[in-house]
Amino acid sequence: IWELKKDVYVVELDWYPDAPGEMVVLTCDTPEEDGITWTLDQSSEVLGSGKTLTIQVKEFGDAGQYTCHKGGEVLSHSLLLLHKKEDGIWSTDILKDQKEPKNKTFLRCEAKNYSGRFTCWWLTTISTDLTFSVKSSRGSSDPQGVTCGAATLSAERVRGDNKEYEYSVECQEDSACPAAEESLPIEVMVDAVHKLKYENYTSSFFIRDIIKPDPPKNLQLKPLKNSRQVEVSWEYPDTWSTPHSYFSLTFCVQVQGKSKREKKDRVFTDKTSATVICRKNASISVRAQDRYYSSSWSEWASVPCS
Amino acid sequence: RNLPVATPDPGMFPCLHHSQNLLRAVSNMLQKARQTLEFYPCTSEEIDHEDITKDKTSTVEACLPLELTKNESCLNSRETSFITNGSCLASRKTSFMMALCLSSIYEDLKMYQVEFKTMNAKLLMDPKRQIFLDQNMLAVIDELMQALNFNSETVPQKSSLEEPDFYKTKIKLCILLHAFRIRAVTIDRVMSYLNAS
């Protein structure tokens, strides 16, 4: 058993049929010595008396808010949560496996630039009685500070018969140099509590590996005389690290109709303009990627060919 | 400790091309190592990230773009003295700071070159003959060093009398390649910045 936060404790349980469970001793936070009784949740049934209560925690029915009273007055609370371990593996029931970039990916993180600011998100099908708390650091043995905000519900989607909820959090490394060469990864730890179930999820990454620039901005077209060709130009996204001559991007320019199966024109360039062949009912799209360290491409920025 | 804005004309900056070749070569070599050594811990997640130039050179700090010198997190107190002549400089107006930066890059390359050559000598003794360093990568390191054209003491190639542990050598190769790729990215960014300034 360990303390998650004040008056909230996590009991780690090996979860299998007829498991013996864990013996837990609760102590009432009071100078009083006599006339103390214990109850669980809303029940008025007295579980025991005395300053300490010893319980055997085996299942979710044994978890919950234990309260010690004296003469009708509440003295203190202890909330017990369960963390299940099945076949040596901690449960991951609360969050959905996003399976990208690999199986058992519960947290996904992205950064728009090298400033040390990043966003992580996760998915769940649970809609109520759910809380998250996020901590982060650079490295684990001698951790350096990363400050994370509160996790918020950022999107709701319908997937078949289920509703899916996306939560996200923004974090900022306390003293980040955009030009630095990372040797210690960022560690992100998410505590998830659903009702009386506790789970924790972690992710470890270098900012350089989670870079995904915003799409290029200000796409403009200029038809070329006596030609099917069009000059398309754009600018670096505002959120990208500066100076741009140091943090350079490379671009992919594509002309395609509405269907992905349609024919297309595609060209890669380090410049902020390119010449392509425009077709009726097609769109010109441009996306960006770090020129020197190939992490993710940005989403497409598009304009119609017409 | 930063790069000035007044730097050589773009056409006068021969190191940019060499640095692009360097990044390409080390990226290809790293990819080859990951594929060949698939049963060894050779991915970014599996290896310890070590920097053999730590406390010996200060390329990131010496080559910091002017725009980032206002960022206190980028200013490290490490001081290193460098030799200050070089053919990539191509302009008499080139400042001492830029010479310091290019000299630091040269020292990085020299250190990695020695490590890689020592390692290749060990790998050539491996009866499995599983992996060797790409000669193209070694040649590209050499070309960039020649383009930088700094005079410095020759670092003797490390020789070891004991029987090499090939497993450890291959893991060290992965560690070195990952670190060198990161440094090659920095070098490419620096050259691009200097070329554009």
Partner: antibody
Framework: QVQLVQSGAEVKKPGSSVKVSCKAS????????LHWVRQAPGQGLEWMGW????????EYAPKFQGRVTITADESTSTAYMELSSLRSEDTAVYYC???????????WGQGTLVTVSS | DIVMTQSPLSLPVTPGEPASISCRAS??????LHWYQQKPGQAPRLLIY???QSISGVPSRFSGSGSGTDFTLTISSLQPEDFATYMC?????????FGQGTKVEIK
């Protein structure tokens, strides 16, 4: 299986014209760009131009502008390349090639040898 | 027009040995570079597109690398059926242009 089948070899006099055909099978004809590329004996490849069979749009290499005409007949899934004012240096194997991507070629015809000789 | 220069023009290789062919562009073409194989009396066959992207059905011993002006096609271990002429092609701008070809011959 996508295939491009070209017309047979031709022998032409200098100053005359030649029209080579390229019939496509497998896949929808208008879903691909169609190009013509030639190769003189013992030489490298030389791109001549492309057509979008969907709308008849064409683009030619400046070297052949005014001398080459590429057309397409959607009803027969056939593309044509006509080269006029032939000279001896136009002796080459002419290939048609296609792709859903405009700028490179993933399926080629077998080639048509055009010999220009007086 | 962008000029593509291949080297060497002829490359004698022992079967089973690796081979590398270089292609250089007269100006930067990013990764807009494609590789073809051609055997005598046959049409070219696409091997690699956009400098390093492999084609399904093409053996994995063929790989491409490079960007900007310098590109390489590598055959990790030459098989008897690989003796042919290899050409690079740029797609950075029209007109599309090809390298003059490298003939890989049996040593």
């Amino acid at each position: 299986q996508v295939q491009l089948v070209q017309s047979g070899a031709e022998v032409k006099k200098p100053g005359s014209s030649v029209k080579v055909s390229c019939k496509a099978s497998g896949g929808t004809f208008s879903d691909y760009y169609l190009h013509w590329v030639r190769q003189a004996p013992g030489q490298g490849l030389e791109w001549m131009g492309w057509i979008d069979p969907e709308n008849g749009d064409t683009e030619y290499a400046p070297k052949f502008q005014g001398r080459v005409t590429i057309t397409a007949d959607e009803s027969t899934s056939t593309a044509y390349m006509e080269l006029s004012s032939l000279r001896s240096e136009d002796t080459a194997v002419y290939y048609c090639a296609r792709n859903k991507e405009l700028r490179y070629f993933d399926v080629w015809g077998q080639g048509t040898l055009v010999t220009v000789s007086s | 027009d962008i000029v593509m220069t291949q080297s060497p023009l002829s490359l004698p290789v022992t079967p089973g040995e690796p081979a590398s062919i270089s292609c250089r562009a007269s100006q930067s073409i990013s990764i807009n570079l494609h590789w073809y194989q051609q055997k005598p009396g046959q049409a070219p066959r696409l091997l690699i597109y956009f400098a390093s992207q492999s084609i399904s059905g093409v053996p994995s011993r063929f790989s491409g690398s490079g960007s900007g002006t310098d590109f390489t096609l590598t055959i990790s271990s030459l098989q008897p059926e690989d003796f042919a002429t290899y050409m690079c092609q740029q797609s950075n701008s029209f007109p599309l242009t090809f390298g003059q070809g490298t003939k890989v011959e049996i040593k």
